[in-house]
């Protein structure tokens, strides 16, 4: 039997330096977690102790702190080459600053193989990317050879700005060839590593032929066998055994997100490259684990243009940017508006030429907003200033929800009405009227929604039954702020860019603002 | 300590349906797969299909496609095995068996006789 | 279908003797291979798995080994408890198939 040992990471999100236990901001040193010089000291200590090692990455190393907004991917290429990546697979954030934004800071100055199968380019690209990415890649392990075979979620070009030029294929469909391929050349031990999210990472191992191992991301899942360490819960045993349809146990681990677990899987193969045992756990990086002290010093000169960025104008305002709780939470703000239009700005994803775009709904929880801006500072808007609007660090997502979902959650929005309350929701492609003289959960009389599947954008009724896709920060997803209804009903979830990322880009874009309070919520006469 | 649990002896006529069901206890019942097997009077065991009631993946043996159907039902922890158009050549113990990572059918239940007699 | 053929398809032993069954597939199966004892009105009991990892509990003196088409059960110290039918399975392919089985009786 030959032992091999997959350490991996996946959805890491410009976490390059240490978070705390929720993956913001790091504030008490003791009690963080995670980022890259911690990393390297766990990989380094596993490469010393056992013989055969690999480590992977599934994608998403691209967008979630500042990191990724001042260098571009330039951070992800230089610190992955430092702790000595085997070999990446494409995620869809990788997309996000379009085809040039992924080839020039990562592609062309990766040392690691950066892997995807289902993704095909064509005219003018074609030859451009040519062996920048690749299907698969055959690595030497010890005395043996390992091949690993790429895919990317077959949903990135409603997700990021791949453009034109890349198609994105079913990725059993894709998966296949490629694997078959890896046989004829005597490879006997195949890992499938992938950014589709759990379920087709489980798909994978039951459908995709020859595949030994899946190695995912994109769902943030985390899998523990045993008591976990942290505040993670498990949505099943690591690693996860899938009973492929020829009949074969394949093993499907993920490993949570932003860093703050390395994945840690020993797989025993026999000498036909069946897999015969495996075991392990996602290890949770903290403060036990030191930092390892030349990647550390590296992270904190290449912090130095950071704290430069975080003054330096991003555009400008005209108006007062009113993210007060006095309005936010009672009414329609203007902060609330200029956000939600920098999320839908955001979502512009022209791939149908029967709609106009996607998405046209945003919903934002009024207590997510924690600070107005000013404009009599000569109108200036900085990262910092942006940083004290949204101090969380969480993403806005894109969902989606039946219209019977929607209106349980304006009826939440309201429940409660006048105390101050966080849920107060704030809107963007929606015209909402409620009557508060009504009883709590039969309060939103109007609910009209913005079309998509139009020339010219309109405002519809709501329909019940209909399946909507909104834009919403991720506390909501999760069901934040008591919307427990978009947690249990949502039908698809997808994590989208740093929540002060779209805003800042959005800023920036625009250069000068002048967002208005504009009837998107209204009251009907006789209540408000 | 894990325990497959079978329903009670069965005597049905040619052309009927059974339906046997296996009640598990003593582990998570939607993180293992549940394999139905069957074993004819003095024949070798035969291996009938599979259900995972994690996300209700199913695998049947082409022999017993179109007149087997293996279920879940994961509020009960149980897993049920219909078998139709039963001949008299259906006649045998069926097993239900829980598989442990690498070991296939590594639990089994105590076993349910079937009996097939016009 | 892969086809399992034991042999012997029965055995007389006495307590203490070493005793071989083997295992041939009509195929290549590598070394996915299980091993289950069964005793009459019960249900088989998985010994071992993978040509030669015993389950849980399984005593030492059960042990596996084969590779490709030819596979063996031994078991090196017979007990009395050890008297049974014994079958084998390969587990490579679907469907998974098993051995006609090899009943071992008390000489």
């Known amino acids: 039997a030959w032992e091999l040992t997959i350490l991996h990471t996946n959805d890491v999100h410009s976490r390059l330096e240490q978070t705390s236990e929720d993956s913001s901001k790091c504030v008490n040193a003791s009690r963080c977690m995670g980022g890259v010089a911690r990393l390297f000291t766990k990989v380094q200590q596993i490469r010393r102790a056992e013989p055969n090692v690999l480590l992977l990455d599934a994608g998403d190393q691209y967008q979630g702190t500042i990191w990724f907004t001042v260098y571009k991917g330039a951070e992800v290429a230089h610190f992955m080459n430092a702790l000595r990546y085997d070999a990446m697979a494409l995620g869809n954030h990788e997309f996000d600053n379009g085809v040039e934004g992924l080839i020039e800071p990562l592609l062309k100055e990766a040392k690691f193989p950066i892997l995807s199968a289902n993704i095909k380019a064509k005219g003018p690209l074609a030859s451009q990317i040519s062996g920048l990415y690749l299907p698969y890649k055959v690595l030497p392990v010890g005395d043996e050879v390992v091949g690993i075979v790429g895919y990317t979620s077959k949903e990135t070009p409603f997700l990021s700005n791949p453009g034109t030029n890349l198609v994105f294929e079913d990725e059993i469909t894709a998966l296949q060839p490629e694997v078959d391929k890896l046989k004829t050349l005597n490879v006997n031990k195949i890992i499938a590593l992938g950014h589709s999210g759990f379920e087709m990472d489980k798909l994978i191992a039951q459908k995709v032929r020859g595949v030994d191992v899946v190695v995912g991301g994109h769902s943030n899942t985390f899998l523990y066998t045993g008591n976990p360490p942290s505040k993670e819960v498990p949505a099943g045993k690591y690693p996860f055994i899938v009973t492929s349809d020829d009949g074969r146990k394949v093993p499907v681990v993920q490993a949570y997100a932003f860093g703050k677990y390395l994945g840690y899987l020993k797989i025993e193969f026999d000498e036909r490259g069946n897999v015969i045992s495996s075991h392990g756990n996602p290890i949770l990086l903290n403060s036990s684990i030191p930092e390892d002290p030349s990647i550390k010093a590296d992270i904190n000169k290449w912090r130095i243009k950071l704290d430069n960025y975080s003054t330096q104008e991003l555009g400008k305002t005209i108006v007062y940017l009113d993210g007060s709780s006095q309005s936010c939470r009672f009414r329609e703000c203007n902060m609330g508006n200029l956000i939600c239009d920098a999320m839908i700005n955001n979502n512009l994803r022209h791939t149908d030429e029967m709609f106009w775009n996607h998405v046209s709904m945003c919903i934002l929880n009024g207590g997510g907003i924690r600070s107005p801006i000013d404009e009599r500072n000569n109108g200036t808007i900085t990262w910092e200033n942006l940083a004290a609007v949204l101090p969380f660090g969480g993403t806005f997502d894109l969902v989606q929800l039946k219209g019977s979902t929607l209106k349980k959650a304006f009826e939440h929005s309201v429940h409660r009405y006048g105390q101050s309350t966080g849920e107060f929701l704030q809107v963007g492609g929606i015209h909402v009227v409620y009557d508060l003289s009504r009883k709590p959960g039969d309060r939103v009389v109007k609910l009209d929604v913005l079309c998509t599947k139009c020339r010219v954008p309109s405002y519809d009724p709501l329909k019940m039954d209909e399946v909507y896709k909104v834009i919403l920060p991720n506390f909501l997803a999760n069901g934040g702020d008591g919307f427990q209804m978009i947690k249990d009903e949502l039908l698809r979830h997808d994590s989208g860019d740093q929540d002060i990322n779209v805003v800042s880009t959005y800023i920036s874009k625009m250069k000068v603002i002048y967002p208005a309070v504009e009837g998107r919520i209204k009251f009907s006469t006789g209540s408000h | 300590q894990v325990q497959l649990v079978q329903s009670g002896a069965e005597v049905k006529k040619p052309g009927a349906s059974v339906k046997v069901s296996c009640k598990t206890s003593g582990y998570t019942f939607t993180n293992y797969y549940i394999y139905w097997v069957r074993q004819a009077p003095g024949q070798r065991l035969e291996w009938m299909g599979w259900?995972?009631?994690?996300?209700?993946?199913?695998k049947y043996n082409e022999k017993f496609k179109g007149r087997v159907t293996i279920t879940a039902d994961t509020s009960a922890s149980t897993a049920y095995m219909e078998l139709s158009s039963l001949r008299s050549e259906d006649t045998a113990v069926y097993y239900c068996?829980?598989?442990?990572?690498?070991?296939?059918?590594?639990?089994w239940g105590q076993g349910t006789l079937v009996t097939v007699s016009s | 279908d892969i086809q399992m053929t034991q042999s012997p398809s029965s055995l007389s032993a006495s307590v203490g003797d070493r005793v071989t069954i083997t295992c041939k597939a009509s195929q290549d199966v590598s070394t996915a291979v299980a091993w289950y004892q069964q005793k009459p009105g019960k249900a088989p009991k998985l010994l071992i798995y993978w040509t030669n990892t015993r389950h849980t509990g399984v005593p030492s003196r059960f042990s596996g080994s084969g590779s490709g088409t030819d596979h063996t059960l031994t078991i090196s110290s017979l007990q009395p408890e050890d008297f049974a039918t014994y079958y084998c399975q390969q587990h490579y392919s679907t469907p998974f198939t098993f051995g006609q089985g090899t009943k071992l009786e008390i000489k």
């Open positions: 259900i995972y009631p994690g996300n209700l993946n199913i």
């Open positions: 068996a829980r598989d442990d990572n690498y070991a296939w059918f590594a639990y």
